[in-house]
């Protein structure tokens, strides 16, 4: 494929990566599943700079990012190392909490409305972030 | 490479104290619930208690409610289980392990309780 | 509480031998079970999480599936390190239960 080398239509620009939110709900898993759809992924936060970025489109709302532990470990999904990355959890999470009754734990991270992490249940319909990045190959064939 | 490794086990008489520990290494401690599993000998594998990752959720089996307490020291990336009013029953090997799945065990440690 | 049975509790099976261990939950689950393996003297390892999710680093003849109350934990050539006993575990709802182990040893 080519090099994308401007973000499509509708997409925001920082720091050499496109970002697209949502104005809707879905679930974590469908959510995912829309940012692979457009050869994106949800949103991947590696700096402060970044959270800010987010932070300041996002708004007070629950908004889901790319970093899920439902295999047991904290991954983020596009394979940045969750151990040694930024991180930015309210204090006391992510608590893996049972008390919604729904069933497991909290297995999926999103931005709160003050921006900082918590861990939820997958299954919640928040918002989302889609992240793509630029001078990475597309999978549209070149324009002849 | 995560290591969980279990210590202060030994023999103690009924309605005795003793305080487990887990040093844990090579992850994130803070990020992540932990839980004590016990096996007493011969038997099978049953689950004691669990702690959030910030302490603000704890969970007991009810057969140690009252008599066990769960803690963590994130700082120190300890986990800990003090076990007051032992009883013969408590006799097992203790483990730790990570997440609710219990992706990543301890070797264990022995408690004894015995006159 | 939810209740965790296994069946069969022991097999004899021979190297090369497909193996399958069933778990049943007293209620559904969703997919909230694990799968490990014990050796004597041992701490358990884990085998499988989320019902058919793979451990790190555990070799793919270990298989897993099914959802809600039944499920099945495959092996499909049984080797010389296999012979262990074999525990399922639900996260699904506190307290937490095993299973009471499957012993597989050999023919």
């Known amino acids: 494929g080519s090099e994308r080398t401007c973000c499509p239509v509708n997409w925001v620009e920082h720091e050499r990566s496109c970002y697209w939110f949502s104005r809707s709900g879905k679930a974590w898993a469908d959510a995912d599943n829309y940012c692979r759809l457009e050869d994106a992924h949800l949103v991947v936060v590696t700096s402060w700079e970044e959270q800010k970025f987010v932070q300041h489109h996002i708004g007070p709302v629950n908004t889901w990012m790319g970093l899920h532990d439902q295999n047991g470990p904290w991954k983020w999904v596009d394979g940045t190392d969750y151990e040694t990355g930024f991180k930015n959890w309210r204090p006391e999470q992510p608590d893996d909490w049972y008390g919604h009754g729904l069933g497991g734990g909290e297995d999926c991270a999103h931005f709160t409305d003050d921006g900082r992490w918590n861990d939820d249940v997958c299954q919640r319909p928040y918002r989302w972030v889609c992240e793509t990045e630029l001078d990475k190959a597309s999978q549209e064939p070149p324009l002849l | 490479e995560v290591q969980l490794v279990e210590s202060g086990g030994g023999l103690v008489k009924p309605g005795g104290s003793l305080r487990l520990s887990c040093a844990a290494s090579?992850?994130?401690?803070?990020?992540?619930?932990m839980n004590w599993v016990r096996q007493a000998p011969g038997k099978g594998l049953e689950w004691v208690s669990s702690?959030?990752?910030?302490?603000?959720?704890?969970y007991y089996a009810d057969s140690v409610k009252g008599r066990f307490t769960i803690s963590r020291d994130n700082a120190e990336n300890s986990l800990y289980l003090q076990m007051n009013s032992l009883r013969a029953e408590d006799t097992a090997v203790y483990y730790c392990?990570?997440?609710?799945?219990?992706?990543?065990w301890g070797q264990g440690t022995l408690v004894t309780v015995s006159s | 509480d939810i209740q965790m049975t296994q069946s069969p509790s022991s097999l004899s099976a021979s190297v090369g031998d497909r193996v399958t261990i069933t778990c049943r939950a007293s209620q559904g689950i969703s997919n909230y079970l694990a799968w490990f393996q014990q050796k004597p003297g041992k701490a358990p390892k884990s085998l499988i999480n989320?019902?058919?999710s793979l451990q790190s680093g555990v070799p793919s003849k270990f298989s897993g599936s099914g959802s809600g109350t039944d499920f099945t934990l495959t092996i499909s050539s049984l080797q010389p390190e296999d012979f262990a006993t074999y525990y399922c575990?639900?996260?699904?709802?506190?307290?937490?239960?095993f299973g009471p182990g499957t012993k597989v040893d050999i023919k």
């Open positions: 090579g992850f994130t401690f803070s990020s992540y619930k």
């Open positions: 392990a990570r997440v609710s799945s219990n992706d990543y």
């Open positions: 702690i959030s990752s910030g302490n603000s959720s704890i």
């Open positions: 575990q639900q996260y699904n709802s506190f307290p937490f239960t």
């Open positions: 989320a019902a058919s």
